[in-house]
């Protein structure tokens, strides 16, 4: 499934993300523009054998299971395949562990370069929440 | 078929501003990312900065922090790129250049014509 | 600031020639690794994206692998239309930075 913006906050909201961890809603869904474009089945496969999975590119070495990545470590205990859901529920809980893990949210490159520091909250103007 | 075209070719004194434009066609405007790189005669790429037109807020290199302004028009599908007190080593060739997929590689797909910006007294 | 440094800075060859470039960082990138090539007079033109996707339309003679901080551009056989420098890009953190290019000139 490929979200429209304000439908996205709204799911992420309602999934307990505004103010996770001190991030903004905002900050989910401009993560979430430039990891995967909204696409809940976005997939890349990394140089390394692993793959990013879903609308949040959840790392198949660290974070979910595959099949295919060796030495994965599996640490949100779901298989790869649940981050493609169009049921945002298992990205969500999923990425909770991750921004608790120590680095917050620059564990995502694309959040580092694309939104940490903007004005964040513009991805969630004009949308009711 | 993406098009970007930019303005013409300009020459300016030392210390001066010039603004440069790039007008997309062709594809969605609004929601990608369009970034400016430069390249000095016989020299690399070097990228100074990126806006996102839907939002307008832009985001630049730190080396040209505080000497460049990009903007972006939406509803003239135009990307602009200002920068001030030129010196001789501004003079270049400025692209314009859009995101590409997937996002989080940030490439870049398409790219303007360039536009020869020369510094001279 | 990561620096990204290619090997060769030029080199000569034939066509039909196999031509391998090489592009480091100064930091490990993961597979945020782009290449572009660039012919007299135009813009850059994307090749490879996450350091080893072909972008569509660009011929299966171009290829990338590489991981962390070292990263390959081949030509499986180099073509009369090859003949352009080819610049890395990476886009790990900002601000994003390139090579300083190589240039594929005719032996």
């Known amino acids: 499934k490929v979200f429209g913006r304000c439908e996205l906050a709204a799911a992420m909201k309602r999934h307990g993300l505004d103010n996770y961890r001190g991030y903004s809603l905002g900050n989910w869904v401009c993560a979430a523009k430039f990891e995967s474009n909204f696409n809940t089945q976005a997939t890349n496969r990394n140089t390394d054998g692993s793959t990013d999975y879903g609308i949040l590119q959840i790392n198949s070495r660290w974070w979910c299971n595959d099949g295919r990545t060796p030495g994965s470590r599996n640490l949100c205990n779901i298989p790869c395949s649940a981050l493609l859901s169009s049921d945002i529920t298992a990205s969500v809980n999923c990425a909770k562990k991750i921004v608790s893990d120590g680095n917050g949210m620059n564990a995502w490159v694309a959040w580092r370069n694309r939104c940490k520091g903007t004005d964040v909250q513009a991805w969630i103007r004009g949308c009711r929440l | 078929q993406v098009q970007l075209v930019q303005s013409g070719a300009e020459v300016k004194k030392p210390g001066s501003s010039v603004k440069v434009s790039c007008k997309a066609s062709?594809?969605?405007?609004?929601?990608?990312?369009i970034s400016w790189v430069r390249q000095a005669p016989g020299q690399g790429l070097e990228w100074m900065g990126w806006i996102i037109p839907i939002f307008g807020t832009a985001n630049y290199a730190q080396k040209f922090q505080g000497r460049v302004t990009i903007t972006a028009d939406e509803s003239t599908s135009t990307a602009y790129m200002e920068l001030s007190s030129l010196r001789s080593e501004d003079t270049a060739v400025y692209y314009c250049?859009?995101?590409?997929?997937?996002?989080?590689?940030?490439?870049?797909?398409?790219w303007g014509q360039g536009t020869l910006v020369t510094v001279s007294s | 600031d990561i620096q990204m440094t290619q090997s060769p800075s030029s080199l000569s060859a034939s066509v039909g020639d196999r031509v391998t470039i090489t592009c480091r960082a100064s930091q490990s990138i993961s597979s945020y690794l782009n290449w572009y090539q660039q012919k007299p007079g135009k813009a850059p033109k994307l090749l490879i994206y996450?350091?080893?996707s072909l972008q569509s339309g660009v011929p299966s003679r171009f290829s990338g692998s590489g991981s962390g901080t070292d990263f390959t551009l081949t030509i499986s056989s180099l073509q009369p239309e090859d003949f352009a420098t080819y610049y890395c890009?990476?886009?790990?953190?900002?601000?994003?930075?390139f090579g300083q290019g190589t240039k594929v000139e005719i032996k």
């Open positions: 996450a350091a080893s």
């Open positions: 062709g594809g969605t405007f609004s929601s990608y990312g």
């Open positions: 890009q990476q886009s790990y953190s900002t601000p994003l930075t």
């Open positions: 250049a859009r995101d590409g997929n997937p996002f989080r590689y940030w490439p870049f797909d398409y």
